[in-house]
């Protein structure tokens, strides 16, 4: 067989589908690898061919499109399972070709089982809701293209194992689930089960997502530097270890990059010759507000180091702040025999 542009195994496209449910899988060639779509390819005389390698096998096989009730079929650039079986798990390849052109890509498909509470190895999308922010909605994801708009499916929403029927602040509204006022107690996994008829059969689509209640933008503030502050003075003798923590609180902000850094005499620690180490730790509150601590450490501080300016800086989408640490050299305690004796006028 002639050369084929092989894009290899596209592990970015780790597709997971539930056992015994319909699945429609688009050939990734047109979405991520080629600059033209299926219609253009088809009208140019290119043919899309599907085959697969079963789990734990090396042998590529054609897909059997002659199964009872057309369990597996192809429609344009979509491979359909109506429904999936556990042993459909494997690596699937779609190949676009004619006599002069060939391009193919493989992707892994995993058919997973779920229990009665919708627990499964499925990787769940996370939807963030702002705390106490007014009505917010989540929408049952990835159900487009499974049934025509003329079909009216029934949608049932669950929180964990429990059907949402008369929750006091969560209301099912068809494909949407409305949170009247999101609270920390709303954290958890929510599942929509979409049931629709097709050719005298009933199919179910199960979609679970994780809801995480986060800090509201209404309450967001610029970074707050808790340390260093005006109440603490770092008084050291030369030769001692200098440790200065910079502790900064960041309100949760969607897609904000939180940064903390030290400057010494206006320069980044990397740009100066003194032996400084900086260790960072990060903690999060239940609403994903963030506290970052960067500890600046100089093992054996010199009198020159104790004259320098140590400034902690912080930045988020809400603004930038800075705070200098109060560092000074400890005045050595007087030695009694000489200093005190002199003080008493001894000669």
């Amino acid at each position: 067989s002639e050369r084929c542009d092989d894009w290899g195994l596209d592990t970015m496209r780790q597709i997971q589908v539930f056992e015994d449910e319909p699945a429609r899988i688009k050939c990734p060639l047109f979405e991520h690898f080629l600059k033209f779509n299926y219609s253009t390819a088809h009208s140019a005389g290119l043919t899309l061919i599907w085959y697969w390698t079963r789990q734990d096998r090396d042998l590529e096989e054609p897909i059997n499109f002659r199964l009872p009730e057309n369990r597996i079929s192809k429609e344009k650039d979509v491979l359909w399972f109506r429904p999936t079986l556990l042993n459909d798990t494997g690596n699937y390849t779609c190949m676009l070709r004619n006599t002069t052109y060939c391009s193919k890509v493989a992707f892994p498909l995993e058919v997973v089982q779920k229990d009665s509470c919708f627990n499964s190895p499925m990787k769940l999308p996370v939807h963030k809701l702002y705390i106490e922010y007014g009505i917010q909605r989540i929408t049952c994801p990835n159900v487009d293209g499974y049934f025509p708009s003329s079909v009216k499916p029934t949608i049932t929403w669950y929180m964990g194992c429990y059907k949402i029927q008369n929750f006091n602040n969560v209301i099912p509204e068809g494909m949407n689930l409305s949170f009247l006022i999101a609270l920390i107690s709303n954290n958890g996994n929510y599942t929509c089960v979409v049931t629709y008829p097709e050719n005298g059969r009933t199919f179910h689509l199960t979609r679970t997502l994780t809801v995480k209640v986060v800090g509201s933008p209404k309450n967001a503030v610029p970074p707050v530097i808790h340390s260093p502050n005006d109440h603490v003075v770092y008084e050291k003798e030369p030769g001692e270890e200098l440790l200065i923590p910079c502790t900064v609180y960041f309100s949760f902000l969607m897609d904000s990059r939180n940064e903390v850094w030290w400057t010494i005499d206006g320069k980044k620690p990397d740009d100066i010759t003194i032996d400084v180490t900086i260790n960072e730790s990060i903690s999060h509150s239940r609403t994903e507000d963030e506290t970052r601590t960067q500890i600046l450490s100089i093992k054996k501080v010199t009198s020159e180091d104790l004259k320098r300016s140590y400034v902690c800086h912080a930045r988020s989408a809400k603004g930038e702040v800075a705070k200098a640490a109060k560092v000074k050299q400890k005045v050595p305690a007087p030695r009694y025999t000489v200093e005190l004796a002199c003080g008493f006028g001894a000669t």
């Epitope: 009665s116 194992c161 429990y162 929750f167 602040n169 609270l183 107690s185 958890g188």
Partner: antibody, heavy 119, light 107 residues
């Protein structure tokens, strides 16, 4: 650690009501459903219903529909099961049990409350 | 509602022997099944969930198997503290239902 402490034994007359309490400690009360299960003397276990305290949703087994009411008080982390129109067949030990939202088995149980219905 | 049937009603076993308890569902419950142990005057204690996963702190001599409609709880070598009543529970469908129990007694 997690504890569910139930109210003490009760003796009731037929036709009356009983209200059993279940106080939870050790763990967020709002992160769990509280279920009630009963066991008649020498008999097996029978599921009665549940409440999700954080959402106020309660559901009951068909057999007890209309006779049982399960409520919760978040401020005291206490769930209650009230059974009305008592009859002698309701003589049983009543258990509360905690169930995380994402599971469907009873991982922690109360010590049980014996309710005796006798004229 | 799904009816759970346990057999035998009573099982007489000598300490150190193996005990095999059965639980049958009136329709498939997949692997959505739990086993509990109950001693006189005590609340039940979770042993197994998901048909075969041991709960925290449960000794390895307890094992569960099966899926669909047929399930088994095996106690590989009975200890004196294992003599009790054992219940299965399905949580595949509402209402959740229990078997009537198997009493494991000393032979």
């Amino acid at each position: 650690q997690v504890q569910l402490v139930q109210s003490g034994a009760e003796v009731k007359k037929p036709g009356s009501s009983v209200k059993v309490s279940c106080k939870a400690s050790g763990g967020q009360f709002n992160d769990y459903a509280i279920h009630w299960v009963r066991q008649a003397p020498g008999q097996g276990l029978e599921w009665m219903g549940y409440i999700i305290p954080a959402y106020g949703q309660a559901e009951y087994a068909q057999k007890f529909q209309g006779r049982v009411t399960i409520t919760a008080d978040e401020s005291t982390s206490t769930a209650y099961m009230e059974l009305s129109s008592l009859r002698s067949e309701d003589t049983a030990v009543y258990y509360c049990a905690r169930v995380p939202y994402s599971t469907a088995y009873f991982d922690y149980w109360g010590q049980g409350t014996l309710v005796t219905v006798s004229s | 509602e799904i009816v759970m049937t346990q057999s035998p009603a009573t099982l007489s076993v000598s300490p150190g022997e193996r005990a095999t308890l059965s639980c049958r569902a009136s329709q498939s419950v997949s692997s959505n099944l739990a086993w509990y142990q109950q001693k006189p005057g005590q609340a039940p204690r979770l042993l197994i969930y998901g048909a075969s996963t041991r709960a925290t702190g449960i000794p390895a001599r307890f094992s569960g198997s099966g899926s669909g409609t047929e399930f088994t709880l095996t106690i590989s070598s009975l200890q004196s503290e294992d003599f009790a009543v054992y219940y299965c529970q399905q949580y595949n469908n509402w209402p959740w239902t229990f078997g009537q129990g198997t009493k494991v007694e000393i032979k």
